[in-house]
């Protein structure tokens, strides 16, 4: 999915009002300096691409974050403010339901959510100095 035509300001507002708090709740008890940045993004569409990938694609050591509160709110925000996004996700959602497993918060999931926090911060960053 191409995130170029999303309403970035609305997504930013959704992040600031709820998604950020859910991410903090998930990470509670973890030091903010515990994980180094291992993924980056270079503009808002790119950030949303990487956020979608880390939030909804299973990775080794962290089978699924898709049922977490921050993930469901992320999905809702993208569906509302990214034209055509929800249609592209129907097949992916059906496949996810079949894969659903017992919820376990592993260290790998904590690291992944830490990277998500970094990506969201970059998505919301103020303009850099005019260099």
């Amino acid at each position: 999915y191409d995130f170029t035509n999303c309403d970035f300001e609305k997504i930013k507002a959704a992040y600031l009002s709820t998604i950020s708090k859910d991410l903090i709740t998930y990470m509670s008890g973890t030091k903010s300096t515990e994980f180094n940045n291992t993924v980056s993004c270079s503009n808002r569409p790119h950030c949303l691409t990487e956020i979608q990938s880390l939030t909804f694609n299973p990775t080794a050591g962290c089978a699924s974050l898709a049922k977490e509160m921050f993930a469901m709110k992320t999905k809702a925000a993208l569906a509302i403010w990214c034209p055509g996004y929800s249609e592209t996700q129907i097949n992916a959602t059906q496949a996810m339901k079949k894969r659903r497993k017992r919820k376990v918060t592993t260290n790998k999931c904590l690291e992944q959510v830490s990277q998500l926090q970094g990506l969201w911060r970059r998505f919301n960053r103020p303009l850099l100095k005019q260099q």
């Epitope: 940045n37 291992t38 270079s42 850099l128 260099q131």
Partner: antibody, heavy 122, light 108 residues
Amino acid sequence: QMQLVESGGGVVQPGRSLRLSCAASGFTFRTYGMHWVRQAPGKGLEWVAVIWYSGSDTHYADSVKGRFTITRDNSKNTLNLQMNSLRAEDTAVYYCARSPQWEDIFESMDVWGQGTMVTVSS
Amino acid sequence: SYVLTQPPSVSVAPGQTARITCGGNYIGSFSVHWYQQKPGQAPVLVVYDDSDRPSWIPERFSGSNSGNTATLTISRGEAGDEADYYCQIYVSASRLVVFGGGTKLTVL
């Protein structure tokens, strides 16, 4: 653990070519801009070239423009520097470094390799 | 082309504060990054975006940037701080990375 490992350095005659490589691990390589920086013996750091995270664009220092080419293979997590028409003044330790990128601005170089030595001598 | 000017050397007594400057025209309009390099080692980022610090760098390292001068401040200097320090900017208008000439910090 995030790591950059350079290879390909050595002794080469003036006018000849050399290809340096940088293997990245421990981070999502395709999301970062990548630089080559060099350091001549006893001298300071000199920037050589940068490539965008996607590989779509490249920029070079005037001292190497037209002779050096920076490329990347995001599927293999590797960065390369093809150095042609080498000169004695290209003798240096060559470092690769990663850099987050925002739009067309490259940020700080937060991870560096240990460097590979290139000596241009007849 | 843009030039960043650093003093070749700076000395500090143990426990005292060292200040390393980086001069350039309107440098305050650029984001300045600072690197520490010890002999035989690769550079290490110590301050980025003028005044931010990577999580692994001690709070003794701080930075500021305004007007024509950026400054790296190292408080409570230690022997382990002895190194070369380089400032760096990215000039997007000309698509160039620029390093300062480097400053050798000696802890007396």
